[in-house]
């Protein structure tokens, strides 16, 4: 088909030779008034760059991608010729960086439903260059982690060395969808939830006297739980004395809260102190009684078949420990009066 009528967009991918990174192209189809295929709701031009990623609800996967060989050969179907490039719906994913990805990429609807659709195509001229300037030693990574339950931010790698004041207007996408309210080089997340993970794309425009182009970077964001910095705390028993009836059975429960750790080896045990002697008691297995994002509560009981006079002279100690440290809580039994 004739690509001379396609709208054209120039993009620059500057990749870091130090790290693995991916890149994406959206099928930014234009919006001729008469084309039902390309028609979609758009925000006002003030809010949005020249084109939006194609988001027609029924047509998400109904686009065809081609590469235009530099030698003037016919267009090549991406799926047949380039194993490191994957089409996912209307997005083209480049799995590995390299200057060999430079070239012209064309997308258009698979189904041409009307004569107007013939021109419903977009040509993206992609230039790929390795990052050369060492001036920005600490540029943001293309893989960024956010700590669940805390405040975090996602930085645009190609702009992370610029202050917010100097930074140009940035257009952000998350999993292919425009984040219309985000316009700076950093997205601030007040409280991180797992739905904040995904593929983020940041675009900004650069120009010289001749032309302008879009500088794009892709960030893979993961949400992770941070390891606790606290030793466990004992929630029960709270009191250090317990009223009991002699000759009756007794169960004392120790409930301890352990902060999340990726390598989780909680210790919870009972031991008895009697004058100078100390020994660990064989008690039923510990069991988890509550599990939340940031911690786990584990319970272990000590069971006395019948409380004796000797037990009143002893201290029953619950000992809990994680990789940070340990805590103990002792209980002295006291005979109930009356």
């Amino acid at each position: 088909f004739n690509i001379s009528g396609c709208s054209t967009k120039k993009l620059l991918w500057t990749y870091s030779t130090r790290s693995e990174e991916e890149f994406v192209l959206f099928c930014d189809l234009p919006e001729p008034q008469k084309s039902h295929f390309c028609h979609r709701n758009r925000l006002s031009p003030k809010q949005v760059p020249e084109h939006l990623p194609f988001m027609g609800s029924n047509d998400l996967s109904d686009v065809q991608w081609y590469q235009q060989p530099s030698n003037g050969d016919p267009l090549e179907d991406i799926r047949k010729s380039y194993p490191h490039i994957i089409q996912d719906k209307c997005t083209l994913h480049f799995l590995t960086p390299g200057v060999n990805n430079s070239g012209s990429y064309i997308c258009r609807p698979k189904m041409i439903k009307s004569p107007y659709d013939v021109a419903c195509c977009v040509k993206m001229i992609l230039e790929v260059k390795p990052q050369t300037n060492a001036s920005c030693e600490y540029s943001a990574s293309h893989k960024q982690d956010l700590l669940l339950g805390s405040t975090g931010s996602i930085s645009c790698p190609s702009l992370s060395c610029q202050s917010d004041a100097q930074s140009p207007a940035v257009t952000w996408y998350k999993n292919g969808k425009l984040l219309s309210v985000e316009r700076s080089n950093r997205i601030v997340v007040d409280e991180v939830y797992d739905y904040h993970q995904g593929t983020y794309v940041c675009d900004y425009t650069q120009s010289d006297t001749v032309s302008s182009w879009t500088v794009r970077a892709v960030v893979q964001v993961r949400t992770i739980v941070g390891d606790t910095k606290l030793k466990p705390d004992i929630l029960d028993p709270v009191e250090d004395t317990l009223e009991v009836e002699l000759g009756k059975p007794l169960t004392i429960s120790c409930k301890a809260r352990f902060g999340f750790e990726r390598v989780f080896n909680p210790v919870i045990k009972w031991y008895i102190k009697d004058s100078d002697l100390e020994w660990e008691v064989s008690v039923p297995e510990a069991k988890s009684i509550k599990s939340t994002l940031k911690d786990e509560i584990i319970e272990r009981n000590i069971i006395l078949e019948k409380v004796t006079q000797r037990d009143l002279r002893r201290k029953f100690v619950c000992f809990v420990q994680n990789s940070i440290g340990n805590t103990t809580q002792s209980v002295q039994l006291k005979e109930k009066r009356g």
């Epitope: 939830y193 993970q197 029960d236 509550k290 599990s291 939340t292 994002l293 786990e296 319970e299």
Partner: antibody, heavy 114, light 111 residues
Framework: SLEESGGRLVTPGTPLTLTCTVS????????MGWVRQAPGKGLEYIGY????NTYYANWAKGRFTISKTSTTVDLKITSPTTEDTATYFC?????????????WGPGTLVTVSS | AAVLTQTPSPVSAAVGGTVSISCQSS????????LSWFQQKPGQPPKLLIY???TLASGVPSRFKGSGSGTQFTLTISDVQCDDAATYYC???????????FGGGTEVVVK
Amino acid sequence: SLEESGGRLVTPGTPLTLTCTVSGIDLSSYAMGWVRQAPGKGLEYIGYINRGNTYYANWAKGRFTISKTSTTVDLKITSPTTEDTATYFCARDSYGGDYAFNLWGPGTLVTVSS
Amino acid sequence: AAVLTQTPSPVSAAVGGTVSISCQSSKTIYNDNWLSWFQQKPGQPPKLLIYGASTLASGVPSRFKGSGSGTQFTLTISDVQCDDAATYYCLGSYINSSDNAFGGGTEVVVK
């Protein structure tokens, strides 16, 4: 999103497994719970699963089993009785607890009758 | 097991008025505040309104307010709208999750 399936008419004593299919969210760090509602009645908390551990309401112990894969959370009704006739909802607590269920499936109806 | 007792149903409210629903727990709630409030309309799943006893869930209008601590909690709806007609449930979380339970529900009728 969450979607329950597997609800149907069963005879008393016939085990039944309900499946909650999850898309677009990670199951590893947050509680995924099951709640039920008998026709015309209130909500009942069955239990939840988090980091592979399962927790059941006292009344539900032994009557239900919760398990999960990377994209589904199952609820097995071990030996249904007519009292188990209800709409069963799966829900997710994105706030890090076991009680603030902010994501819900539409529910699936289980009818136990002889 | 813990028991959560809610204001008996139904509770009437006038459009533009204020309505309060109480929820009392037989045991102390975990962290004193692990209690949530849900709104449910017929044929729909419940919708989270409040968690942590007083924190508004995402997208919930500020007309909904949760208060209380320990064993006594209240949901207050101010400037009541017709759309607020529904059944409201509290859900308590305890140190031992096996005690977790819903309250019996309170139906709010808007006149």
